[in-house]
Interface confidence: medium
């Protein structure tokens, strides 16, 4: 019926998901750059992965337009609080997109992490967790930026991490 | 043409998504060992339910391999600060293969809850949320463990529980 | 062979997910009504959308049964804690149906966030994120409750959401 | 089964020290909390602190503090507790005990048999 | 510091009768659902043994006659029927927060 060959096509697909895009990015000693910018990522090695998104400077991107859950978990740390640090750590996903010259905030989160050492100890930790859909067009990006990006520990990919899929 | 069953099976699967393996497991009473062990969750009483994946021992194991997104929180909670309590809690999904020999980290988060007692009331809550996309071949098992185990609370199954669906 | 627009229909869907159910609804000044209610949301500016759900008054509405990830988050702030503060503040995830007189617990999460404040800064800034798999029936809704309310910070629709996609 | 045996009892002279064991059997000591508690002749109990043997670390009723120092030795499995600058008032059975494991219901489900410490000039 | 107060000091029962002892917390003891106040049994010449965990746990290899109710600051033990071996000195005890404190104690004796 000269359906054949995609039809078998779309069963592959419906039973393997082999193309809805998905991405894990981990965090890498490289992340941290100190310059302004977004923390960049590990694409490849470990758990990391890209399926129909690319990645570019910090940025996942789409290749396909649609909705997609991206979310993002930052591990933060420290021993008392930097000199300088705001009462505020801003964990952030934003969006660049050819339509405006500016990043869009898409999902935010202050936190307050050096109120958490104990009294026994200085030493504090905090984990910033985001997660939510938004649409993105073919060539859009998306990127964390973490303001005091001084506090984010990296370690060994498991604890700082950037991801999406499509819905 | 040929294709008449599958094809109607196609369509309800399209629509009804009934074949996407998912799952989210519940906190319980049988939930904190204290063997050393991963948390134990319930399966099929009130919100808990598995589909297309199985559990054992603690663990969620793929019968379908593919990219799932795992997801798990727990609930911390305490009156003041328990004995021998190091100042972080870990909270993390871990993998299980017959490729390796150990446990292999996937998504981990480290707290210090213990600091966020008021200076009013020694009670504090707080609460550790992972999520992200991993593979799975079949087989695979993916486990929640948190040290100490011994600040999670469980109550009723909506404050710490643990999950996946495949993306 | 009698497929054709149907077909063409499920290439389609394949391909762009479009009959998906998915859901991203963002804070706004009329989300806190201080009534006892829950939380109320944006469903159509900025980065708000419905596709395949409806909303009434809060509430995210199924129109397809089925397994749903269902997820908030709400950013929490202050100067200090407020008179009367609990030392405890409620996030969760509620479900209304027909069959129940009462709402149901799905997703809960406890915190103390007020224990953050510094020691050289009586602000202090908290996140608290829920996600999880649950089952929706047609007609029946998911709503976000906040205990205490007053420390809901909304700003831009970025910091404070609700969402959902069918799994 | 679990049990906990305290050494002998003991005399000691006004200002002077004592050094209390508990050796532990029958659990995974470094697991639970040990407990120490004394009673007064004819008196109520008096919860003077507590040792984790996973990690040494300690609490102590404010009471005691400076003057009680608890301690645990993993290889022996024994738990002991010094009290210094004795006075006769710290005349006292003590009493050393297993907390629960899920600290925040700290209740005390075995208990050592007991070491009298009597403080004379 | 939690205070603890039992009622009565002493109380006279007979045999085969029911015991009521109370205890009062000077503040709650109530955490997440639970309620942290435990039960202990006292001979002469013997160390405590617990009987009641968390307010109405019963300890295990305890007789089903001995019953724990209460929530918040005021707390009951109940022996539904005396036997002679229950005759002792019994506290209650606080674990919501250290230092962890005892009642006074309450003397259960044979009327």
């Known amino acids: 019926d000269g359906h054949g060959g995609s039809w078998e096509q779309l069963i592959q697909e419906r039973r393997s998901h082999q193309n809805n895009p998905a991405a894990h990015l981990t965090g890498a000693n490289s992340s941290l750059t100190g310059s302004g910018g977004p923390l960049l990522w590990e694409t490849q090695l470990g758990l990391a992965f890209l399926r129909g998104l690319d990645y570019h400077d910090g940025a996942l991107v789409a290749n396909k337009a649609g909705y997609y859950y991206i979310y993002s978990k930052v591990q933060l740390g420290g021993v008392g609080c930097p000199l300088g640090l705001a009462s505020t750590i801003t964990h952030g996903l934003y969006k660049r997109t050819p339509r405006y010259p500016e990043e869009l905030e898409l999902l935010v989160s202050q936190q307050s992490p050096c109120g958490r050492a104990t009294s026994n100890s200085r030493v504090w930790w905090d984990s910033s967790f985001l997660g939510g859909v938004v649409h993105l067009e073919v060539g859009e990006e998306v990127v964390v930026r973490v303001l005091d990006e001084r506090l984010v520990r990296l370690r060994d990919g498991t604890r700082s991490y950037f991801g999406a899929f499509m819905v | 043409d040929g294709h008449g069953g599958s094809w109607e099976q196609l369509i309800q699967e399209r629509r009804s998504h009934q074949n996407n393996p998912a799952a989210h497991l519940t906190g319980a009473n049988s939930s904190l060992t204290g063997s050393g062990g991963p948390l134990l969750w319930e399966t099929q009483l009130g919100l808990a339910f598995l589909r297309g994946l199985d559990y054992h021992d603690g663990a969620l194991v793929a019968n379908k391999a593919g990219y799932y997104y795992i997801y798990s929180k727990v609930q911390l909670g305490g009156v003041g600060c328990p004995l021998g309590l190091a100042s972080t809690i870990t909270h993390g999904l871990y993998k299980r293969t017959p490729r390796y020999p150990e446990e292999l980290e996937l998504l981990v988060s480290q707290q210090s809850p213990c600091g966020r007692a008021t200076s009013n009331s020694r009670v504090w809550w707080d609460s550790s949320f992972l999520g992200g996309v991993v593979h799975l071949e079949v087989g695979e098992e993916v486990v929640v463990r948190v040290l100490d185990e011994r600040l999670v609370r469980l109550r009723d199954g909506t404050r710490s529980y643990f999950g996946a669906f495949m993306v | 062979d009698g497929h054709g627009g149907s077909w063409e229909q499920l290439i389609q869907e394949r391909r762009s997910h479009q009959n998906n159910p998915a859901a991203h609804l963002t804070g706004a000044n009329s989300s806190l009504t201080g009534s006892g209610g829950p939380l109320l949301w944006e469903t159509q500016l900025g980065l708000a959308f419905l596709r395949g759900l409806d909303y009434h008054d809060g509430a995210l509405v199924a129109n397809k049964a089925g397994y749903y990830y269902i997820y908030s988050k709400v950013q929490l702030g202050g100067v200090g804690c407020p008179l009367g503060l609990a030392s405890t503040i409620t996030h969760g995830l509620y479900k209304r149906t027909p069959r129940y007189p009462e709402e149901l617990e799905l997703l809960v999460s406890q915190q103390s966030p007020c224990g953050r404040a510094t020691s050289n800064s009586r602000v202090w800034w908290d996140s608290s994120f829920l996600g999880g798999v649950v089952h929706l029936e047609v007609g029946e809704e998911v709503v976000v409750r906040v205990l205490d309310e007053r420390l809901v910070r909304l700003r831009d629709g970025t910091r404070s959401y609700f969402g959902a996609f069918m799994v | 089964q679990v049990q906990l045996v305290q050494s002998g009892a003991e005399v000691k002279k006004p200002g002077a020290s004592v050094k209390v064991s508990c050796k532990a059997s029958g659990y995974t000591f470094t697991s639970y909390n040990v407990h120490w508690v004394r009673q007064a002749p004819g008196q109520g109990l008096e919860w003077i602190g507590a040792v984790y043997p996973g990690n040494g670390d300690t609490s102590y009723n404010q009471k005691f503090k400076g003057r009680a120092t608890l301690t645990a030795d993993k290889s022996t499995s024994t738990a002991y507790m010094e009290l210094s600058s004795l006075r006769s008032e710290d005349t006292a059975v003590y009493y050393c005990a297993r907390g629960s494991y899920y600290y925040t219901s700290s209740y005390f489900d075995h208990w050592g048999q007991g070491t009298l410490v009597t403080v004379s000039s | 510091e939690i205070v603890m107060t039992q009622s009565p000091a002493t109380l006279s029962v007979s045999p085969g009768e029911r015991a009521t002892l109370s205890c009062k917390a000077s503040?709650?003891?109530?955490?997440?659902?639970?309620?942290?106040m435990n039960w202990y049994q006292q001979k002469p010449g013997q160390a405590p043994r617990l009987l009641i965990y968390?307010?109405?746990n019963l300890e295990s290899g305890i007789p089903a006659r001995f019953s724990g109710s209460g929530s918040g600051t005021e707390f009951t033990l109940t022996i539904s029927s005396l036997q002679s071996e229950d005759f002792a000195v019994y506290y209650c005890?606080?674990?919501?927060?250290?230092?962890?404190?005892f009642g006074q104690g309450t003397k259960l004796e044979i009327k």
């Open positions: 005890q606080q674990s919501y927060e250290d230092p962890f404190t």
């Open positions: 968390t307010a109405s």
């Open positions: 503040q709650s003891v109530d955490f997440d659902g639970d309620s942290y």
